[in-house]
Interface confidence: low
């Protein structure tokens, strides 16, 4: 099976604009891109699968996604302490500024997608 | 004032291995990344991988992997890079760097670097 | 890999006048806006010196006569007014991709 689960950071040093609501743009594509490839840093444990439903929020720039781990592999504590632990990296290989870190279960059934 | 001191010169014979240690001092060791850089006589600079003290994660040039371990100890402040099955193409001189940011936290870049460490593989 | 590409191997300038040295990476190392390409210059017997970040900023305590542009792909170092301390082999590093990869060098010398 596979467990989901719902994170939402705020990039306080980039600013939202409307080509983030478009995904053909340049800008959409590269910010998916580049934190897509951050995820697969984050996450180098066998039991990351993927992430999913990226989208883009004002308030600078807030980033909500959808992360998929192989069931029994890791729980939302340890999704956010590593999410957390790697902010200081992300600033450096990113230049991402992060703040404002929640995730949560995404609840079933969604999660029963496997 | 940010310092990376490295140990000395080595002299090692083919097949066998070395373990180059450097010291930092001056700034928060942990959440800085350490590069590993050589330079073969004569030669230009080669990116060899990274470790970050903090956690233990590493990065590593695929054309090292399998030969280059590097490790850290955050109670000393110290990395250590240990490279085996030596041969004489290995001869270098070895630098490991910080890659740090300004006062600010406004960029990144590989800003202090040791005074390197000459490693001779000769039979 | 990115592929660092220099030009020219070797440069030789008179004191004052201008030396251009030029490097092209094989894809974009452009990241939300910042180039990821930084410049070093590098004496015999010692480590390399940052001298630009960020293809264009000037490292603290770096004289001015240096400066770095370009983006994406292909980039420039410039020393306006050569001084015979700027003597030197540079490189140029990408650090937007592992493995990082430098510039074969250039080496200036007086003409």
């Known amino acids: 099976g596979v467990s989901f689960f719902f994170l939402s950071f705020h990039i306080s040093n980039l600013q939202f604009n409307s080509s983030l609501e478009d995904p053909s743009t340049d800008y959409y594509q590269e910010l998916q891109r580049d934190i897509s490839e951050m995820f697969l840093q984050i996450y180098k444990q066998g039991g990351f699968l993927g992430l999913s439903n990226i989208k883009f929020r004002p308030g600078s720039v807030v980033v909500q996604l959808t992360l998929a781990f192989r069931e029994g592999t890791i729980n939302v504590h340890d999704v956010e302490t590593q999410f957390n632990q790697y902010k200081t990296e992300a600033a450096s290989r990113y230049n991402l500024t992060i703040s404002d870190v929640s995730v949560s279960d995404v609840p079933f059934p969604f999660s029963a997608q496997s | 004032e940010v310092q990376l001191v490295q140990s000395g010169a080595e002299v090692k014979k083919p097949g066998a291995s070395v373990k180059v240690s450097c010291k930092a001092s001056?700034?928060?060791?942990?959440?800085?990344?350490i590069e590993w850089v050589r330079q073969a006589p004569g030669q230009g600079l080669e990116w060899m991988g990274e470790?970050?003290?903090?956690?233990?994660?590493?990065n590593y040039n695929e054309k090292f992997k399998g030969r280059v371990t590097f490790t850290a100890d955050t109670s000393t402040n110290t990395v250590y890079m240990e490279l085996s099955s030596l041969r004489s193409e290995d001869t270098a001189v070895y630098y490991c760097?910080?890659?740090?940011?300004?006062?600010?936290?406004?960029?990144?870049?590989?800003?202090?670097w040791g005074q390197g460490t000459t490693v001779t593989v000769s039979s | 890999d990115i592929v660092m590409t220099q030009s020219p191997d070797s440069l030789a300038v008179s004191l004052g006048e201008r030396a251009t040295i030029n490097c092209r990476a094989s894809?974009?190392?452009?990241?939300?806006?910042?180039?990821?390409i930084h410049w070093y210059q590098q004496k015999p017997g010692q480590p390399p010196k940052l001298l630009i970040y960020?293809?264009?900023n000037l490292e603290t305590g770096v004289p001015d006569r240096f400066s770095g542009s370009g983006s994406r792909t292909d980039f420039t170092l410039t020393i306006s007014s050569l001084q015979a301390e700027d003597v030197a082999v540079y490189y140029c590093?990408?650090?937007?991709?592992?493995?990082?990869?430098f510039g074969g060098g250039t080496k200036v010398e007086i003409k």
């Open positions: 760097a910080r890659y740090g940011d300004d006062t600010s936290g406004g960029y990144y870049a590989v800003d202090y």
């Open positions: 001056g700034y928060r060791f942990i959440p800085y990344w």
């Open positions: 470790i970050l003290p903090g956690t233990g994660r590493t």
């Open positions: 894809e974009s190392v452009n990241i939300l806006g910042t180039n990821l």
């Open positions: 960020h293809a264009s």
């Open positions: 590093l990408q650090s937007r991709k592992i493995p990082w990869t």
